[in-house]
């Protein structure tokens, strides 16, 4: 460590010999007093009136209170101007001033970089009274200095509402380089250049930077801080760090991993959550993203059927949530389902394929040749039909649903009947006379109710009319249903 000291003629001579703790410019003597966490302005008590603090601002007094004698200007003695020391060392420095005893109340405060140091710092003030003057030495000590202690320290003394300010004592705490910016982990595209930044400060300056990639020095010649390293591209993951060197030694940054973006791993654990006749709800667990965020996913669906042409249906969906409802599927069919996801680099491989089945659907066609006629003697309506030509996917026929609507003089009533799958005829009781009965029939499977047949109408006359001619739905391709009364 180095100290700088200036000695000048004293404006107001004190004592023939040095005072304890003052005017010492050798460095060792400046590293003594202990230090607490806060700073405290020195409170100085008059040697003539113990217990009573001096008050007032620094002034340049010219005249005594009697107004008879001209006094030289008051000023702090020059002392060490610059103290350079290493981090964690102790330091002590002081201000000294000789004050004529005519001034009763004075205070000395310590300031750093323009701010008063308040609190419980180790500031100690000693008094050395004489007949005409009192020598005051204000000492400031810091133990285990840190970089934050760097700065310009001054003493201020108030006398007669004026201020006397000392020359600054500049404390420079030197240590190993301190990083203000370190390289950061990144995910980069293969064989594409990118930059890393490293910045470190002293004191002491300059700070030189060396870059290290996978334990090999990138620049054998140092670069002044801050340094930007252009990495010309990577084909595989690499670890980078930077070394900051100054006259005190070397500090190494954290090592950062630079990953190479790649296509994602395939999704795993594709699961079936719900199946209906025409849709399947699936979920999956995304694979590793390849150090690049997922953009979207693709659900691939193949029908497992020797007679199918093996074509693949592709449904694109967002990457999250990891769930998709596949629609527009055939009922009672087997499917093989796989999922692939993509990031900016490309598509993953397809997940392991899973098998899933849709449930049976409702019939897609209505019963044929629906015939309706009135059996007046029994006061009911006979209905006959032919079993529909249902596809296998519709599942097993479990019965029929018959809708009959009775309309007469402004009233309308719909009734539903269920009949078993073995039937191809049914009888329903006449509900209203002098009314129109409209009959429709739908086939029913476990998958649901199919479409209703075209309506067949029959007129139910008042009691006494007899007409056994049926009403019926035409065979496919015939004209509209005929209403026979």
């Amino acid at each position: 460590a180095i100290t700088e000291a200036r000695e000048e003629a004293k404006p107001y001579p004190l004592f023939p010999g040095p005072l304890p703790g003052s005017l010492q410019t050798d460095h060792t003597s400046l590293l003594s007093l202990p230090h607490t966490s806060g700073y405290q302005p020195a409170l100085m008590f008059s040697p003539t009136q113990p217990g009573r603090p001096y008050t007032g601002n620094v002034a340049i007094p010219r005249v005594t209170s009697a107004g008879s004698k001209l006094l030289p200007p008051l000023a702090f003695k020059h002392t060490v101007g610059h103290i350079i020391l290493s981090e964690h060392k102790d330091v002590k420095f002081n201000c000294s001033i000789s004050v004529p005893n005519i001034y009763q109340d004075t205070t000395i405060s310590w300031w750093k970089d323009g701010k008063e140091l308040l609190g419980a710092h180790h500031a100690i003030t000693q008094f050395y009274p004489d007949d005409e003057v009192t020598a005051i030495i204000a000492s400031f000590s810091i133990t285990s200095v840190q970089r934050s202690d760097n700065g310009s320290y001054i003493c201020k003394m108030k006398i007669n509402n004026e201020e006397i300010v000392s020359d600054p004592i500049y404390i420079e705490v030197q240590g190993l380089p301190h990083f203000t910016k370190q390289p950061e982990s990144m995910n980069v595209t293969r064989n594409t250049a990118f930059n890393l930044t490293c910045q470190a400060v002293g004191p002491p300056e300059p700070v030189n930077i060396f870059w290290v990639q996978n334990s090999s020095r990138v620049n054998e010649q140092p670069e002044k801080s801050p340094s930007v390293l252009t990495v010309p591209g990577l084909t595989e993951m690499a670890v980078f760090s930077c070394e900051a060197h100054n006259d005190k030694g070397l500090t190494v940054s954290k090592g950062v991993q630079i990953n190479i973006k790649a296509i994602p791993s395939p999704p795993t654990e594709v699961s079936i959550h719900n199946s209906t006749a025409h849709s399947i709800l699936i979920s999956w667990v995304p694979g590793f993203d390849g150090y690049s965020p997922f953009r979207n996913c693709s659900v691939q669906v193949k029908e497992v059927d020797p007679l199918s042409n093996g074509s693949v249906m592709i449904f694109n969906t967002s990457a999250s949530p990891h769930m998709y409802q596949i629609k527009q599927l055939q009922a009672l069919a087997n499917y093989s389902i796989g999922v692939s996801c993509m990031n900016e680099i490309g598509w993953s491989a397809v997940s392991p394929w899973i098998l899933a089945s849709t449930t049976e659907g409702a019939p897609s066609v209505a019963p044929l040749n629906v015939t309706v006629f009135l059996n007046e003697s029994r006061d009911n309506v006979d209905i006959r039909w032919m079993k529909p030509l249902t596809k296998r996917q519709a599942g097993e026929l479990v019965g029929y649903r018959i809708s009959h609507v009775w309309q007469s003089a402004g009233i309308s009533k719909e009734l539903l009947e269920e009949v078993g799958q073995n039937n191809s005829r049914a009888q329903i009781s006449v509900q209203v006379h002098n009314a129109t009965c409209t009959v429709r029939i739908a086939a029913v499977t476990k998958g649901g109710v199919g479409p209703f047949s075209d309506p067949v109408k029959i007129f139910i006359p008042a009691h006494g009319w007899v007409d056994h001619a049926p009403s019926s739905t035409p065979a496919p391709g015939n004209a509209d249903p005929v209403l026979i009364i």
Epitope: N191, W211, Q213, N214, S216, V218, N219, E220, Q221, P222, L229, T230, P232, G233, T235, A238
Partner: antibody
């Protein structure tokens, strides 16, 4: 533009010394290291080592420790290669090359032929 | 020291041909650089850091590889490409060169 200009060919007797110069221009001399590369007649390239132009510290590869000295005069942006106690097998073209990050020799001098013959 | 082995050592080819020169390292390296040298001339940087074209180098030159295996490819040989090519590794000191590949006109 970046240029490295080397001194001319030298014919020396065995046991003598030679000093080859390499003058750099077109860039800040102390920002890049300076390497030396040897090429014996009809042979490939051999990296001899380099000198840190910022600190002046030379680094030699194992085969070039002892009789070979790298030095600098930064005031004239010049690097030097001195070979003492010359032997016949030192006959070669000696190249200086600017040495940048990742050990890239991005600019080369034109080469200096040193012939050692009695 | 890391040994670099170039293959082939000699290569005869015609203008317009596509040629590939291989450089194999005795252990894994970080990057490979490639230089071109014509008779009586200094080497010239061609490709640095495995795959980056040096300034002014035509795009018919390309480089690839990682670990211990690297290649220099010239997609369509031009008359001015007939020269000797050297690979040089970065990743382990001392830096070493391959023994060279001499590309001759067939």
């Amino acid at each position: 533009q970046v240029q490295l200009v080397q001194s001319g060919s030298e014919l020396k007797k065995p046991g003598a010394s030679v000093k080859v110069s390499c003058k750099a221009s077109g860039y800040i001399f102390t920002s890049y290291g300076l390497s030396w590369v040897r090429q014996a007649p009809g042979q490939g390239l051999e990296w001899m080592g380099w000198i840190n132009t910022y600190s002046g510290v030379p680094t030699y590869t194992d085969d070039f420790k002892g009789r070979f000295v790298f030095s600098l005069d930064t005031s004239v942006s010049t690097a030097y290669l001195q070979i003492s106690s010359l032997k016949a097998e030192d006959t070669a073209v000696y190249y200086c090359a600017r040495y940048t990050n990742y050990g890239v020799f991005d600019y080369w001098g034109q080469g200096t032929l040193v012939t050692v013959s009695s | 020291d890391i040994q670099l082995t170039q293959s082939p050592s000699f290569l005869s080819a015609s203008v317009g041909d596509r040629v590939t020169i291989t450089c194999r390292a005795s252990s894994s390296v970080g990057y490979m650089h490639w230089y071109q040298q014509k008779p009586g001339k200094a080497p010239k940087l061609l490709i640095y850091a495995t795959s980056n074209l040096a300034q002014g180098v035509p795009s018919r030159f390309s480089g690839s590889g990682s670990g211990t295996g690297f290649t220099l490819t010239i997609s369509s040989l031009q008359p001015e490409d007939f020269a000797t090519y050297y690979c040089q590794q970065w990743g382990s000191l001392p830096f070493t060169f391959g023994q060279g590949t001499k590309l001759e006109i067939k």
